[in-house]
């Protein structure tokens, strides 16, 4: 789709006469009729297949024509067309005298014609004007012309439709050849895909607008390369999402069990030495002369029978000393070494005695590990998800989050690209390894059958007697340009032989 523009510049008719040589009274009130048609080796009358236009009276006898002249006319004259520009044309410009105000052809006498010029040739689409001057014995016409594409049409023959946009469906402007040019920050075939913040993690991050980096569940930070610990985690970190790896001094599945009670709570009194002894438990080693769990009580040597669990008390200069039986320790033999009786195994692990009860070992159920079965096994280490799927540890199982185009428990199945009916105008979709392919019906082309292509009305060779055939792209019909000696819509009749 485009416009043939004709700019009239100057008309000279010094003697003020008609084509017949008869003078105009009082002068030649001149207007123009323009006919644009398909290329003809010899320009002949007939339909103005590319369009026609008339001007109002522009002047008398000799005059210059101003741009955008007043009186309802436009200069340059516009001859719009809604087909692919063929690159060739024929142009007829007639100058007429208007005795009255009615400029319709039927209202004018045939001898009101002042002059008629006809040209033909090649003309490429472009912004540059072609200047021309046509002279007859009595008149001279100076004009220029060009063909430009209509808004949103591009290419050598104005056949490519491209409308710039900046919305959900695309972010682009149009290049002179009609190809898309993505706005900064956008990419993809239709410039719908934002370019994320530089460095944004390819799997863990995504974006909905340029220079953004949004994290998928379980990830955080500017580039989505830092994990988020488990919801219930208290004093732990992670190396993959939803983990809970305990900080120093903390234990348990959610790192909520204090293994460093001494440092955190300083429970031992009177200068006693504190020793951590498991979850939320501690041992105070009292200085001489003190006793009690927290060494809060003063002691009178062995008189108070301080040694427990069968320990024997020995008096010393600076207090006393307990000799503990096997399996016990502490200042007063008050602590037994940790054994299965202390239920040290988490998450249903079973305890086995070792060294005659002096120590133990935990046998862990599936999905748990660690010396106390306190750690959850990461089921994603075997990379079970196919086709770039993302593995997520979720509850008692693992799950695969599939990339677009894949489905199945392990993302092992390819989703048909044709499921979305991507082919326009009744095109047939074919699933291929490399993507999809559309087979287009007659009159359409392009990757998705989105481009309308003109039907070639000349394909059936409708013109006789070596006539030249042209397709009228506005109506998808043919026009026959007859050689000398033949007439008719198909040039089927010799001149002088009327149709029977």
């Amino acid at each position: 789709s485009g416009v043939f523009q004709l700019q009239l510049q100057e008309f000279v008719n010094e003697r003020g006469v008609l084509a017949s040589g008869r003078p105009c009274e009082p002068g030649c009130r001149t207007f123009f009729r323009v006919c644009l048609k398909h290329f003809q080796a010899v320009v002949s009358p007939g339909p103005c297949t590319f369009g026609s236009v008339s001007t109002p009276v522009l002047g008398t006898n000799s005059f210059a024509v101003r741009d955008d002249s007043s009186g309802g006319g436009r200069n340059p004259l516009q001859l719009p067309f809604n087909f692919t520009w063929p690159g060739t044309f024929s142009l007829i410009i007639e100058a007429w005298h208007a005795p009255g105000d009615d400029l319709r052809p039927e209202a004018l006498p045939p001898d009101a014609l002042i002059s008629k010029i006809a040209i033909q040739g090649s003309l490429a689409v472009g912004q540059n004007w072609l200047l021309d001057e046509q002279t007859s014995t009595l008149t001279r016409l100076r004009y220029s012309y060009r063909v430009i594409c209509s808004d949103n049409y591009y290419g050598d023959n104005c056949s490519r439709l491209c409308k710039k946009r900046n919305d959900h469906f695309g972010h682009y402007v149009c290049q002179p050849d009609g190809n898309l040019s993505c706005l900064p920050g956008w990419t993809g075939e239709y410039c719908q895909q934002p370019i994320c913040l530089s460095g944004c993690h390819e799997q863990n991050g995504y974006c909905s607008k340029p220079a953004e980096c949004l994290c998928r569940p379980g990830w955080q930070g500017r580039l989505c390369n830092e994990c988020i610990p488990h919801n219930g985690c208290r004093h732990g970190t992670c190396s993959t999402p939803w983990q809970c790896t305990c900080d120093e001094g903390w234990g348990g599945l959610f790192c909520d069990q204090d293994l460093n009670y001494c440092t955190h709570h300083s429970p031992c009194k009177n200068g006693a030495t504190c020793s951590n002894s498991g979850q939320r438990s501690y041992t105070c080693t009292c200085r001489p002369g003190y006793t009690g769990v927290d060494c809060e009580l003063e002691l009178s040597e062995c008189d108070s029978n301080p040694c427990r669990n069968g320990g024997s008390c020995k008096d010393q200069e600076d207090g006393y000393h307990c000799l503990c039986p096997p399996g016990y320790y502490g200042l007063h033999c008050e602590h037994s070494t940790l054994s299965c009786a202390d239920s040290p195994c988490f998450n249903g692990g079973s305890c086995r005695e070792r060294n005659q009860g002096a120590s133990y070992a935990c046998e862990c159920p599936p999905n748990f590990t660690g010396s106390n079965c306190e750690k959850k096994v990461d089921r994603c280490t075997s990379n079970p998800c196919a086709n770039g799927g993302q593995c997520l540890n979720r509850g008692p199982s693992r799950m695969c989050r599939c990339r677009p185009g894949f489905t199945g428990t392990y993302c092992e199945r390819h989703v048909s690209d044709c499921a979305r009916n991507p082919c326009a105008h009744g095109g047939t979709c074919h699933d291929l390894e490399s993507g999809l392919m559309c087979t287009c019906p007659a009159g359409f082309s392009g990757r998705r059958c989105e481009v309308r292509t003109s039907i070639d009305a000349c394909a059936s060779s409708p013109c006789f007697n070596r006539a030249t055939c042209y397709t009228d792209l506005s109506t998808d019909t043919f026009v026959c340009n007859c050689p000398y000696g033949f007439v008719g819509s198909r040039c089927e009749f010799p001149v002088g032989l009327p149709p029977s």
Epitope: R216, Q220, E226, I228, P229, N231, C233, H235
Partner: antibody, heavy 118, light 107 residues
Framework: EVQLVESGGGLVQPGGSLRLSCAAS????????MAWVRQAPGKGLEWVAT????????YYRDSVKGRFTISRDNAKNSLYLQMNSLRAEDTAVYYC???????????WGQGTLVTVSS | DIQMTQSPSSLSASVGDRVTITCRAS??????LAWYQQKPGKAPKLLIF???DLADGVPSRFSGSGSGTDFTLTISSLQPEDFATYYC?????????FGQGTKLEIK
């Protein structure tokens, strides 16, 4: 026990400013992303802002962008929300919560009421 | 933004009843959905995350199911302390969004 205690709420005129604080305890504050979530009187819950634990990256809902600033001080186990150019529609109970925009909000404070009115 | 629609908006039930609340997302959110319980004048409390995982200390009468766009919270046998407002929340897409809430009242 995890505890989140908000403070700093009150009555403020439209266009005014307020700074909310949240004191955290019972967990290693520096290890976890934090958020503010609000609830207008008689209405539902609405996420306001988030800050990561790793590098302090911040995110805001569109209606508060440029007016509110979320920040944290790991040494003080504290989360903050600086609210400027307050509007009547910002009136709500503001909750401090542990979580990111892409994770559940596992623990919540008791909330502090912010009333914007002339 | 993803729209989260809860139904019903309010619900009357008796102690011992089995109750189901549904939540629908305007687009696929995989299993990235949480449920919260809120009592008047109190802060919300996380009940369920990742659609079906119970948060620490939540009774087993609460359960969650679904994936994609349709999710449900079920309370198998209502207890007096369960009367409250329940909210669903998606955290699959930015920004996180909540449902409008379902108020569970005593019949």
């Amino acid at each position: 026990e995890v505890q989140l205690v908000e403070s700093g709420g009150g009555l403020v005129q439209p266009g005014g400013s307020l700074r909310l604080s949240c004191a955290a305890s019972g967990f290693t504050f520096s290890n976890f992303p934090m958020a503010w979530v609000r609830q207008a009187p008689g209405k539902g819950l609405e996420w306001v802002a988030t800050i990561s634990s790793s590098d302090g990256t911040t995110y805001y809902r569109d209606s508060v962008k440029g007016r509110f600033t979320i920040s944290r001080d790991n040494a003080k186990n504290s989360l903050y929300l600086q609210m400027n150019s307050l509007r009547a529609e910002d009136t709500a109970v503001y909750y401090c919560a542990r979580g990111y925009y892409n994770s559940p909000f596992a623990y919540w404070g008791q909330g502090t009421l912010v009333t914007v009115s002339s | 933004d993803i729209q989260m629609t809860q139904s019903p908006s309010s619900l009357s039930a008796s102690v011992g009843d089995r109750v189901t609340i549904t939540c629908r997302a305007s687009q696929d959110i995989y299993i990235n959905l949480a449920w919260y319980q809120q009592k008047p004048g109190k802060a919300p409390k996380l009940l369920i995350f990742d659609t079906s995982d119970l948060a620490d200390g939540v009774p087993s009468r609460f359960s969650g199911s679904g994936s994609g766009t349709d999710f449900t919270l079920t309370i198998s046998s209502l207890q007096p302390e369960d009367f409250a407002t329940y909210y669903c929340q998606q955290y699959d897409y930015y920004p996180p969004t909540f449902g409008q809430g379902t108020k569970l009242e005593i019949k």
